[in-house]
C-alpha cells in the first residue's frame, strides 16, 4: 500500500539525492568513455548475451512508478539497488590501471548515495534490516570479461540512475 505522501520527504534530502545521482551519472559516463576509448567497448547492447552468461543482475525499481509510488518500498528498492551496484563495482576491481581511479570514485559515490537514502529512511522510521551479505556476484574469468562486465555494469547503473532521477525529481516537485 502506498505509504504517506511524498511531501513527508524533506526537500533538502531530495535535492541532495538529485545532486548525488548527477554526480554518479558523471562518474559512470567517465567510466564508459574510458572503456570505449581504451578498449573499443562502446556498445553495451552488443554485450547483452555475455551479460546473461556472466550473470550480471538488474536492480528493480518497481515500487517507484509516479502513479502509485510506495514511499517505503521505493526508498528500500533504491537502497537495495545501490547496495547491489556496490557489489558489482567491487567485482570489477583490478579492471585496469587506467580505469582504477574512475572506478574508485564511482564506488565511493554509490556508497555515499546509499548512505543518504538509508539515513532518511532511518529518520522516517522505515529503515530496512541491514543486509548481512551481498548476493552472488559475477566472477570474471578473463580481462576481457571484466572489461565487458564494466561496460554492462556501467550501462545498468546508468539506467537505474535515470529512473531514480525521474522519481526523485517527481517527488521534489511542490
Amino acid at each position: 500500500t502506498p505509504l504517506g505522501p511524498a511531501s513527508s520527504l524533506p526537500q533538502s534530502f531530495l535535492l541532495k539525492c538529485l545532486e548525488q545521482v548527477r554526480k554518479i551519472q558523471g562518474d559512470g559516463a567517465a567510466l564508459q568513455e574510458k572503456l570505449c576509448a581504451t578498449y573499443k567497448l562502446c556498445h553495451p547492447e552488443e554485450l547483452v548475451l555475455l551479460g546473461h552468461s556472466l550473470g550480471i543482475p538488474w536492480a528493480p525499481l518497481s515500487s517507484c512508478p509516479s502513479q502509485a509510488l510506495q514511499l517505503a518500498g521505493c526508498l528500500s528498492q533504491l537502497h537495495s539497488g545501490l547496495f547491489l551496484y556496490q557489489g558489482l563495482l567491487q567485482a570489477l576491481e583490478g579492471i585496469s590501471p587506467e580505469l582504477g581511479p574512475t572506478l574508485d570514485t564511482l564506488q565511493l559515490d554509490v556508497a555515499d548515495f546509499a548512505t543518504t537514502i538509508w539515513q532518511q529512511m532511518e529518520e522516517l522510521g522505515m529503515a530496512p534490516a541491514l543486509q548481512p551479505t551481498q548476493g552472488a556476484m559475477p566472477a570474471f574469468a578473463s580481462a576481457f570479461q571484466r572489461r565487458a562486465g564494466g561496460v554492462l555494469v556501467a550501462s545498468h547503473l546508468q539506467s537505474f540512475l535515470e529512473v531514480s532521477y525521474r522519481v526523485l525529481r517527481h517527488l521534489a516537485q511542490p
Epitope: 545532486e19 554526480k23 556496490q86 556508497a111 548515495f113 538509508w118 539515513q119
Partner: antibody
C-alpha cells in the same frame, strides 16, 4: 551523539606493524564509510583510504596501497587501520573520520592516535 | 591526483580585523551537476580537525556566519569578517571531487 574513540598512542620499531582501532557509537555503523587520515608532526593532512563496512570493501591512496590494511568489525562497530613495514616517516597522528556526502563528510573525527616509529 | 595549494602558509591577524585565505586546485572542482566539491576544515590547537565549509560555500552546522567562502572551479577564498581569538588554528582546504581526496598544506592563523 556520534562518537569515534581511537586506541592509545603506540611506539614501534622500524619494520614493525601497527594496528589502530576506531570504535564508533551513536549511529548505525555499517551504513557509513570510515576514512583514515594522517598528520605527520608539523605537516598537513594526508588521506590514507576508506572502508565500507557494509560490504567490507576498502580503497586506498596509491601511496599506501602496499602497506595499509583497513578492516571493520560490524559486531563491535569498530574500524581498524593496520600499517606495516613502518619507517620513521610514518610517525604521525592517525585519525578516523566518518564519511558521507555534503555536510556529512568528515563531520565527525576520532581524537587521533599518535604512532611514533623510532629505533 | 588533484593538488591543492594554499596561501599564505602563515597569517597573523589582529582581533576584529578581517582575514582571507586562498586555495587553488590543479583541476576544476566544479562538477557537471553544478556542485563544487571544495571543503574547508579548521584544526584548533591540540584538537582534531572540524568541518567549516562544505561544497565551496555552505556553512557547516554551528559555524558562525563571520565565516564565508567563495570561488570559481579552481580558485577559492575563505574569509573571516572579524577574527576572534577562538579562530586560531590551521585552516585546510580539501577536495572530494575524486579519489584520492587531497588537502592543502594548511594556513596557520594566529593572533597578532
Amino acid at each position: 551523539q556520534v562518537q569515534l574513540v581511537q586506541s592509545g598512542a603506540e611506539v614501534k620499531k622500524p619494520g614493525a606493524s601497527v594496528k589502530v582501532s576506531c570504535k564508533a557509537s551513536g549511529y548505525t555503523f555499517p551504513i557509513y564509510t570510515m576514512h583514515w587520515i594522517r598528520q605527520a608532526p608539523g605537516q598537513g593532512l594526508e588521506w590514507i583510504g576508506y572502508i565500507n563496512p557494509s560490504i567490507g570493501y576498502a580503497n586506498y591512496n596509491q601511496k599506501f596501497r602496499d602497506r595499509a590494511t583497513l578492516t571493520a568489525d560490524t559486531s563491535t562497530s569498530t574500524a581498524y587501520m593496520e600499517l606495516s613495514s613502518l619507517r620513521s616517516e610514518d610517525t604521525a597522528v592517525y585519525y578516523c573520520a566518518r564519511g558521507g556526502y555534503g555536510d556529512s563528510l568528515f563531520a565527525y573525527w576520532g581524537q587521533g592516535t599518535l604512532v611514533t616509529v623510532s629505533s | 591526483d588533484i593538488v591543492m595549494t594554499q596561501s599564505p602558509l602563515s597569517l597573523p591577524v589582529t582581533p576584529g580585523e578581517p582575514a582571507s585565505i586562498s586555495c587553488r586546485s590543479s583541476k576544476s572542482l566544479l562538477h557537471s551537476n553544478g556542485i563544487t566539491y571544495l571543503y574547508w576544515y579548521l584544526q584548533k590547537p591540540g584538537q582534531s580537525p572540524q568541518l567549516l565549509i562544505y561544497q565551496m560555500s555552505n556553512l557547516a552546522s554551528g559555524v558562525p556566519d563571520r565565516f564565508s567562502s567563495s570561488g570559481s572551479g579552481t580558485d577559492f577564498t575563505l574569509k573571516i569578517s572579524r577574527v576572534e581569538a577562538e579562530d586560531v588554528g590551521v585552516y585546510y582546504c580539501a577536495q572530494n571531487l575524486e579519489l584520492p581526496y587531497t588537502f592543502g598544506q594548511g594556513t596557520k592563523l594566529e593572533i597578532k
